[in-house]
Interface confidence: low
């Protein structure tokens, strides 16, 4: 999906009002210095691409983020403020079999959410030069 035509200010507002708090809640009990933020993005569409990947793509060491509160709110924000985004997600959602879920929080998930926090911060400051 091409995030170029999203309403970035509305997504930023959604992040500041709720998503950021949910990310902090998920990371509660973790020192802010525990993980280095290495995942980067160069502009707002790129940031949203990376945010989508880390939030919704299944990973080998962390497989449970898509059902977290911050992930569901991220999905809602993208669906509302990115034209055509929800259509691109329908097939993927329908393809998933309905099974009983169990919540698993692993260290790899904590690292991944730490990276997500960095990507969101970068998304909110698009004019900053890359370090």
């Amino acid at each position: 999906y091409d995030f170029t035509n999203c309403d970035f200010e509305k997504i930023k507002a959604a992040y500041l009002s709720t998503i950021s708090k949910d990310l902090i809640t998920y990371m509660s009990g973790t020192k802010s210095t525990e993980f280095n933020n290495t995942v980067s993005c160069s502009n707002r569409p790129h940031c949203l691409t990376e945010i989508q990947s880390l939030t919704f793509n299944p990973t080998a060491g962390c497989a449970s983020l898509a059902k977290e509160m911050f992930a569901m709110k991220t999905k809602a924000a993208l669906a509302i403020w990115c034209p055509g985004y929800s259509e691109t997600q329908i097939n993927a959602t329908q393809a998933m079999k309905k099974r009983r879920k169990r919540k698993v929080t692993t260290n790899k998930c904590l690292e991944q959410v730490s990276q997500l926090q960095g990507l969101w911060r970068r998304f909110n400051r698009p004019l900053l030069k890359q370090q």
């Epitope: 995942v39 980067s40 990947s53 880390l54 793509n57 080998a60 060491g61 059902k67 879920k101 690292e111």
Partner: antibody, heavy 121, light 112 residues
Framework: EVQLVESGGGLVQPGGSLRLSCAAS????????MTWVRQAPGKGLEWVSS????????YYADSVKGRFTISRDNAKNSLSLQMNSLRAEDTAVYYC??????????????WGQGVLVTVSS | DIVMTQTPLSLSVTPGEPASISCRSS???????????LHWYLQKPGQSPQLLIY???HRASGVPDRFSGSGSDTDFTLKISRVEAEDVGVYYC?????????FGGGTKVEIK
């Protein structure tokens, strides 16, 4: 073009050391987990080690644990594998690969050309 | 460790004919997130392996649609609808549900 280029292979005596390097280009290296896979002559593929994008988590195959060390330098787009106490059974082509955890369910979607390590006296 | 078993060991196929490779895991590769962590690779003669299929059935970028993956839990299949000369090589399945990640022993596909 997305590319991984390995270097540092060669002939080494049993008990010796070798350091493999992998130079990444064409993608944002720091956004991906990286993995080393090896293939002994005429044999199949064997997973060796993986490192997460921020180096927070590192995994090794039992066969190399305590002898091999994986590391990365995101500023230089490089991955390394320090191999100590080498044995004859470590003789293989070593592949640097992208993946092992971050995207596409951990599948390895980019592979280097491989570098041959021969352990022999 | 999860053991991956591939059959057959080798396969000789006439161009244009279909081919099928089986991969069986010693335990289910289905995670509670509903994804199944099984991937397929092809190693052509003298080349590095390349990703064909990820997460059971998703074709990697640039992979022809004659390749398809299917299966669930512990039993998986890679199908080539019409084998072409360029499809020769060794096919491997891999699980990334848990470390150590493990590969199948490989299936060598030749052209008759």
């Amino acid at each position: 073009e997305v590319q991984l280029v390995e270097s540092g292979g060669g002939l080494v005596q049993p008990g010796g050391s070798l350091r493999l390097s992998c130079a990444a280009s064409g993608f944002t290296f720091s956004n991906y987990d990286m993995t080393w896979v090896r293939q002994a002559p005429g044999k199949g593929l064997e997973w060796v080690s993986s490192i997460t994008f921020a180096s927070s988590y590192i995994y090794y195959a039992d066969s190399v644990k305590g002898r091999f060390t994986i590391s990365r330098d995101n500023a230089k787009n490089s991955l390394s594998l320090q191999m100590n106490s080498l044995r004859a059974e470590d003789t293989a082509v070593y592949y640097c690969t992208r993946g092992g955890g971050a995207y596409y369910g951990g599948s390895l979607d980019v592979w280097g050309q491989g570098v041959l390590v021969t352990v022999s006296s | 460790d999860i053991v991956m078993t591939q059959t057959p060991l080798s396969l000789s196929v006439t161009p244009g004919e279909p081919a099928s490779i089986s991969c069986r895991s010693s335990q289910s590769l289905l995670h509670s997130n509903e994804y199944t962590y099984l991937h397929w690779y092809l190693q052509k003669p003298g080349q590095s392996p390349q990703l064909l299929i990820y997460l059971v059935s998703h074709r990697a970028s640039g992979v022809p649609d004659r390749f398809s993956g299917s299966g669930s839990d512990t039993d998986f299949t890679l199908k080539i609808s019409r084998v072409e000369a360029e499809d020769v090589g060794v096919y491997y399945c891999e699980q990334t549900l848990q470390t150590p990640f493990t590969f199948g022993g490989g299936t060598k596909v030749e052209i008759k």
